[in-house]
Amino acid sequence: KKKEKVKKGSECSEWTWGPCTPSSKDCGMGFREGTCGAQTQRVHCKVPCNWKKEFGADCKYKFESWGACDGSTGTKARQGTLKKARYNAQCQETIRVTKPCTSKTKSKTKAKKGKGKD
């Protein structure tokens, strides 16, 4: 949030302004709300439509912890459950992601016969 000094004869000297929230989809004309003590103001603002979205990915997931390293593939996996989707985003309910085990994990796995942790 932005803070701004205002000197227009009002009792409020420091307004705190929230983000510009488009009225339509992710960009274009919208409103920014400001507060100062008990006072609130709403002003018009614009989010340019050529900006990249600041809100992150269309699909947000909540992930479990990484599973154990699979020695045969050198990867480990975890599952994600859909937490939030942009209104028109057709997101999978659950996803599975994998990544390579670290070299440290691989060496531990070999040394401790599959009991390595990451």
């Epitope: 009225s23 989809k25 939030k84 989707a85 209104y87 028109n88 057709q90 997101c91």
Partner: antibody, heavy 117, light 107 residues
Framework: QVQLVQSGGGLVKPGHSLRLSCAAS????????MNWVRQAPGKGLEWIGM????????ILNQKFKDKATLSVDIAKNSAYLQMNSLRAEDTAVYYC??????????WGQGTLVTVSS | DIVLTQSPATLSLSPGERATLSCRAS??????LHWYQQKPGQAPRLLIY???QSISGIPARFSGSGPGTDFTLTISSLEPEDFAVYYC?????????FGGGTKLEIK
């Protein structure tokens, strides 16, 4: 499959407030947008607004900015619509619906709100 | 706000006939257009979403076309249970808006 059961409707006097409830069961309530729509007797459908249970992000039809307040209670798997300063023209059946762009939506059975003195 | 205009307001047909319902948007809404069926005393039921995508459990006789500003819901061969009111809805921008509805009645 998501099941939505609505409650809280009834007869209310002009100027009073009312809170409608929408209780969800089945698949994860917190992952999907919850819409509120109303339908006056013999009329078409009108969107009031929507809320996402995961973070309570709310998008309200500006027509209802001084009339409606949306909220959720994740612990109770429920969404709420608070309607203030009710007038005769707010008489309608109010629906909640859970929306996923991946699988479509599920609707509550609707609850009738009658504003009359 | 995006205005959705449905036509005709009333459509009188017989079972077995083909029904074509129109929905026109006041500006381009890509494919963010959905079709609902509503029967008296019931909540709306989603038939087609994103202009032409079918919904699980909805009979194959229902189909939709788009995108852009002109959208069509087609019922290839009417069954007695299809006589109801049909609404289009856009989700391209807020506020979400509905068309005024088309009443499909038995001739």
């Amino acid at each position: 499959q998501v099941q939505l059961v609505q409650s809280g409707g009834g007869l209310v006097k002009p100027g009073h407030s009312l809170r409608l409830s929408c209780a969800a069961s089945g698949q994860s309530f917190s992952s999907y947008w919850m819409n509120w729509v109303r339908q006056a007797p013999g009329k078409g459908l009108e969107w009031i607004g929507m809320i996402h249970p995961s973070d309570s992000e709310t998008i309200l039809n500006q027509k209802f900015k001084d009339k409606a307040t949306l909220s959720v209670d994740i612990a109770k798997n429920s969404a709420y619509l608070q309607m203030n300063s009710l007038r005769a023209e707010d008489t309608a059946v109010y629906y909640c619906s859970s929306w996923s762009a991946k699988r479509g939506d599920f609707w509550g059975q609707g609850t009738l709100v009658t504003v009359s003195s | 706000d995006i205005v959705l205009t449905q036509s005709p307001a009333t459509l009188s047909l017989s079972p077995g006939e083909r029904a074509t319902l129109s929905c026109r948007a006041s500006e381009s809404i890509s494919n963010n257009l959905h079709w609902y069926q509503q029967k008296p005393g019931q909540a709306p039921r989603l038939l087609i979403y994103y202009a032409s995508q079918s919904i699980s459990g909805i009979p194959a006789r229902f189909s939709g076309s788009g995108p852009g500003t002109d959208f069509t819901l087609t019922i290839s061969s009417l069954e007695p249970e299809d006589f109801a009111v049909y609404y289009c809805q856009q989700s391209n921008s807020w506020p979400l808006t509905f068309g005024g509805g088309t009443k499909l009645e038995i001739k």
